[in-house]
């Protein structure tokens, strides 16, 4: 599960990019447009974030270029590359538009077939729960386990260091097979088994990824658009984790908005299990203290708490797992 | 490529049954609810009916709930539409759609319901 | 069932000028179950919008919708040639499932 590379796929930023710079008017434009948003760094309001008309006429000049519709990869090498240039040529998006959009992801799924020997599993007891089960999966296997560990140490104790301990939760679910990742985190719990949903909710190590004094969600998700990163994985979870209706349609498939929820572990915008008792997810945040923004964050905590389709899409891989075991693997 | 295609149209008396069938190809199609939505000649759209992923939730138009089952063999990619006890204001024609941000819509097949 | 009406029933409009449909629901719409569609005589629907003011894959920027709770719209900034059709809401927040009955926007 080696690192993708920019050459796999079909319109890369990078690739775009170099392509750009052979031409000396598409370079021009794009080394303009550079300074056009490098005010990124501070989010300005809105109204004083207005383009100026050569940032305009720059993005302009760029639209027939292959900048315009190239898109990244979750996990290829130089990411943070990648979107930069996917921001620098997205003016708009970058300074203060915010409607739901194209992600910078690209996107096309790989469905890899579900590869992981299960029959190793008859060391543990049988009635084990299945967050133990796909725990053991991830440390039988030499990369799961190695990552994990990075992570483990990274936000174990009493003084942690937050960001580091984020980068390598990052790294888990970029790196580790997409299996285990999501058999670690969504793996099925007994209602009544508080301990099962326990392990699960501490998968994550919240008490060191989370913000320990809980924080405005508009604030949040404010700092989390001041990061490229963080902004990419918020847009790709909004463009494929929006519901279509209420059933849980997905605005794409459950798939990727799965891919894109776990995105966001390892961001400012970390969603975790409330409880462990349950299923249901939220960022760490309070819309308390929004005034005439309320229901605007309201909005954006919903849009975690109580998301049909990203609701369905979990309830339908924790079926999955369970139906995993379920079957007889002694053949 | 990406496509729906719907069969199984045709002219039938007031009381007959018809069952529409669509083909899926291109997408999986399992991971995907469906829609029937209809329109009568020279009118607008009409939602019939829908299915979840997995065909464990339908719901219908109150003009033609107890009259019309949706389902889904998802091993075949095809959507159906069984229509019984069919009346002259069942005659529109019949789309099957997936409905999403990528949207498909199938061409349509013609039911027309006439003694 | 929530009704949705639309307005005006028809618009007479000049290739470039704006467009302005309307979509009135019967009761409070959620934002995010609430769709817009274009169709040409003889073609199936196509989705523009969803969510209320998100376009769907492959829809110009010339296209946006707003609003919120009873009251939504569909803008056109500057009429093409190939934008003279008919324009459907649809609500997907409460079954059943409803369409508005239409606005036609016709070449002035």
């Known amino acids: 599960n080696s690192l993708a590379t920019e050459n796999r796929f079909v319109n890369s930023c990078t690739q775009a990019r170099k392509k750009c710079e052979a031409n000396p008017a598409c370079k021009a434009a794009y080394q303009h447009l550079g300074s056009c948003t490098s005010s990124l760094s501070r989010p300005l309001p809105l109204e004083e974030s207005a383009m100026s008309a050569d940032c305009l006429e720059a993005a302009e000049q760029l639209r027939n270029s292959s900048l315009i519709d190239c898109r990244c990869h979750r996990r290829m090498k130089h990411q943070a590359t990648c979107l930069d240039i996917y921001w620098t040529v997205h003016p708009a998006r970058s300074l203060g538009d915010y409607e739901l959009d194209v992600s910078p992801y690209e996107d096309t799924v790989t469905s890899k077939p579900w590869k992981m020997n299960l029959s190793k599993l008859n060391m543990l007891k049988p009635d084990s729960d299945l967050c133990l089960k796909f725990a053991m999966l991830c440390t039988l296997h030499d990369k799961c386990d190695r990552l994990r560990k990075a992570y483990g140490e990274a936000c174990s104790g009493i003084r942690c260091q937050r960001h580091l301990c984020l980068a390598q939760l990052r790294s888990f679910f970029e790196k580790a097979a997409e299996s285990h990742a999501q058999g670690l985190l969504l793996c099925p719990c007994a209602p009544e088994d508080a301990g099962c949903g326990e392990r699960r909710r501490n998968t994550i190590a919240p008490s060191c990824a989370l913000p320990s004094v809980t924080p405005n969600c508009l604030d949040l998700r404010s700092f989390c658009r001041a990061d490229p990163l963080c902004r990419s994985r918020l847009m790709d979870f909004q463009t494929h984790c929006h519901p279509m209706d209420i059933l849980g349609t997905c605005a794409t498939e459950q798939s990727r908005c799965l891919r894109a929820y776990l995105g966001l572990i390892g961001t400012a915008m970390t969603p975790n299990f409330i409880s462990k008792v349950n299923t249901t997810v939220a960022l760490s945040c309070t819309c308390r203290g929004s005034g005439n923004l309320q229901d605007e964050c309201e909005q954006l905590e919903r849009s975690f708490s109580q998301n049909p389709c990203l609701v369905e899409a979990i309830a339908a891989k924790m079926r999955f797992h369970r139906q995993l075991f379920s079957q007889d693997w002694a053949d | 490529q990406v496509q729906l295609v719907e069969s199984g149209g045709g002219l039938v008396q007031p009381g007959g049954s018809l069952r529409l069938s669509c083909a899926a190809s291109g997408f999986t199609f399992s991971n995907y609810t469906m829609h029937w939505v209809r329109q009568a000649p020279g009118k607008g759209l009409e939602w019939v009916s829908v299915i979840s992923y997995d065909g464990s939730s339908t719901y219908y138009a109150d003009s033609v709930k107890g009259r019309f089952t949706i389902s889904r063999d998802n091993s075949k990619n095809t959507l159906y539409l069984q229509m019984n006890s069919l009346r002259a204001e069942d005659t529109a024609v019949y789309y099957c759609a997936r409905i999403v941000r990528m949207d498909i819509w199938g061409q349509g097949t013609l039911v027309t319901v006439s003694s | 069932d929530i009704v949705l009406t639309q307005s005006p029933a028809t618009l007479s409009l000049s290739p470039g000028e704006r467009a302005t449909l309307s979509c009135r629901a019967s009761?409070?719409?959620?934002?995010?179950?609430l769709a817009w569609y274009q169709q040409k005589p003889g073609q199936a629907p196509r989705l523009l919008i969803y969510g209320a003011s998100n376009r769907a894959t492959g829809v110009p920027a010339r296209f946006s919708g707003s609003g919120s709770g009873t009251d939504f719209t569909l803008t056109i900034s500057s009429l093409e040639p190939e934008d003279f059709a008919t324009y459907y809401c649809?609500?997907?927040?409460?079954?059943?499932?409803?369409f508005g009955q239409g606005t036609k926007v016709e070449i002035k």
């Open positions: 649809q609500q997907m927040d409460g079954f059943p499932f409803t």
């Open positions: 009761q409070s719409v959620n934002s995010h179950y």
